[in-house]
């Protein structure tokens, strides 16, 4: 484990104030837990439980992030963990609000230079491969809060200080106001709100809905771009097939995106990325002769 990380500061479960939400019954079932004369009950949710070593992982990621991003050295990682924990511990996991995450959002405040925001929808890996090469562009997961939570699941229980490692609410089957969904909605909204200049979005051209109104991009980010700060949204439609030469910028869902964006007084541009492998290679080595032709 992180023995050396925790030598000086143990993770404390019982510190800080905890705001209790009213208990609204979800569709989860109750299962007994603990051994003793008085059985305690744990809500059984449809989704997978909290990622193992969740507290250690969040703290370790924070430490790593501040090490490699010296401009974030002012961040106290123990305080970040306390704020993260405070957002969901002892709260009913179907009644989490964006307000619960505000202390964490405040601690993780970060700005992206204008023209350097990269949004993505259903194509996370390529977006991250791109920003790993194009170091001056940033996805949400390149920011502290996105980095902390990427690929993790977490939830607590009403009126206990415990983390639920057995199950957490599923967005569809249980409730949408769960700790993970509300976190991503909160930080995605903030990420979009603070974007400026030309904003880029990477979209998956292999999906039936290249632009999906129900994705985080379609339901949160698109509607929180600020027209007074954002001049344009440029979509990069990533093709999946080797021989796919169609102009996916003419796809009906892209036209729908264009309509939404234009109505918000933001200009819209679209580009086909026919060869994502070549695209990445050319970002790495722009002087390569094969990069002078289209990608």
């Amino acid at each position: 484990g992180l023995n050396d990380i925790f030598e000086a500061q143990k993770i404390e479960w019982h510190e800080g104030s905890h705001h209790h939400h009213h208990h609204h019954h979800g569709s989860g079932s109750l299962v007994p837990r603990g051994s003793g004369s008085l059985p305690r009950w744990r809500q059984q949710w449809s989704g997978s439980g909290t990622t193992s070593r969740f507290p250690e992982t969040v703290l370790a990621r924070c430490v790593k992030y501040t090490e490699v991003h010296p401009e974030m050295r002012h961040v106290d990682c123990q305080s970040v963990w306390d704020a993260f924990k405070g957002a969901f511990i002892s709260k009913y996991p179907c009644n989490i609000t964006e307000e619960d995450y505000q202390p964490l959002v405040k601690l993780g405040t970060q700005t992206v230079p204008c023209n350097k925001t990269l949004l993505w929808s259903r194509i996370k890996d390529l977006a991250h491969q791109f920003t790993q090469v194009q170091r001056d562009m940033f996805t949400l997961e390149d920011m502290l809060l996105g980095y902390l939570a990427d690929d993790l699941t977490w939830c607590g229980e009403f009126n206990t200080f415990e983390i639920n490692y057995q199950s957490c609410p599923d967005w569809r089957k249980d409730c949408s106001n769960n700790p993970v969904s509300v976190f991503w909605k909160t930080v995605s909204r903030r990420f979009a709100e603070t974007a400026c200049g030309v904003v880029h979005v990477m979209l998956n051209g292999s999906r039936s809905k290249i632009f999906d109104k129900n994705s985080t991009f379609g339901s949160v980010e698109v509607h929180n771009l600020q027209p007074e700060k954002v001049q344009a949204l440029e979509a990069w439609v990533i093709h999946g097939g080797r021989e796919d030469s169609r102009d996916l910028c003419q796809d009906p869902t892209i036209k729908e995106l264009e309509s939404i964006i234009s109505k918000r007084n933001i200009r819209f541009f679209c580009k086909n990325i026919y060869r994502p492998d070549k695209f990445l290679q050319c970002v790495k080595n722009p002087e390569d002769s094969s990069c002078l032709s289209g990608i």
Epitope: G1, I5, R61, V68, P70
Partner: antibody
Framework: EVQLQQSGPEVGRPGSSVKISCKAS????????MNWVKQSPGQGLEWIGW????????DVAEKFKKKATLTADSSSSTAYIYLSGLTSEDTATYFC?????????????WGQGSLVTVSS | DIVMTQSPTSISISVGERVTMNCKAS??????VDWYQQKTGQSPKLLIY???NRYTGVPDRFTGSGSGTDFTFTISNMQAEDLAVYYC?????????FGGGTKLELK
Amino acid sequence: EVQLQQSGPEVGRPGSSVKISCKASGYTFTDSVMNWVKQSPGQGLEWIGWIDPEYGRTDVAEKFKKKATLTADSSSSTAYIYLSGLTSEDTATYFCARTKYNSGYGFPYWGQGSLVTVSS
Amino acid sequence: DIVMTQSPTSISISVGERVTMNCKASQNVDSDVDWYQQKTGQSPKLLIYKASNRYTGVPDRFTGSGSGTDFTFTISNMQAEDLAVYYCMQSNTHPRTFGGGTKLELK
């Protein structure tokens, strides 16, 4: 106890490549960034770059961008540095090193070093 | 890149004496400077982090001070086992950069 165990000495011909390993133990490998540092014979120390083993993300100093490739294998808790196009300038001892929480951003943990000799 | 200029390059000293060495950064690095000791054939050893904090187990005869661009490292009571090369390193900005080193030799 945190330990960083590096591979043994390597001899490479000019133009060839070598790969040095750094096996970590005593902590969860993905919880820390691994750094690499070069020390030429009788010379000072130069920071090469870092790798985040959890994601494979790297940052390499401009001077070493065409020379060094950093990788990591989480399953074996091992970080690697691959040095290509070897020249006499690459003859040096290479160290892996990492920070410790609550000890600033210095390197309290170091591997024992791996000597690379480039010779025809 | 930030240049760390260390001085002097070498010092001749007797056991029991006080020794001071300096490190000057080419731009402000706040207090993000660490000091290392390296003995022949060994890996560097962290002595001081964030300009003035002694690392765990480091004897109190080793002290560091400074902030911004000027940093000082002092051994108050030189011991024979302290013969080594001492390096400063800035960790404020990537790439991290080291000073050229100060070699301690016996008079």
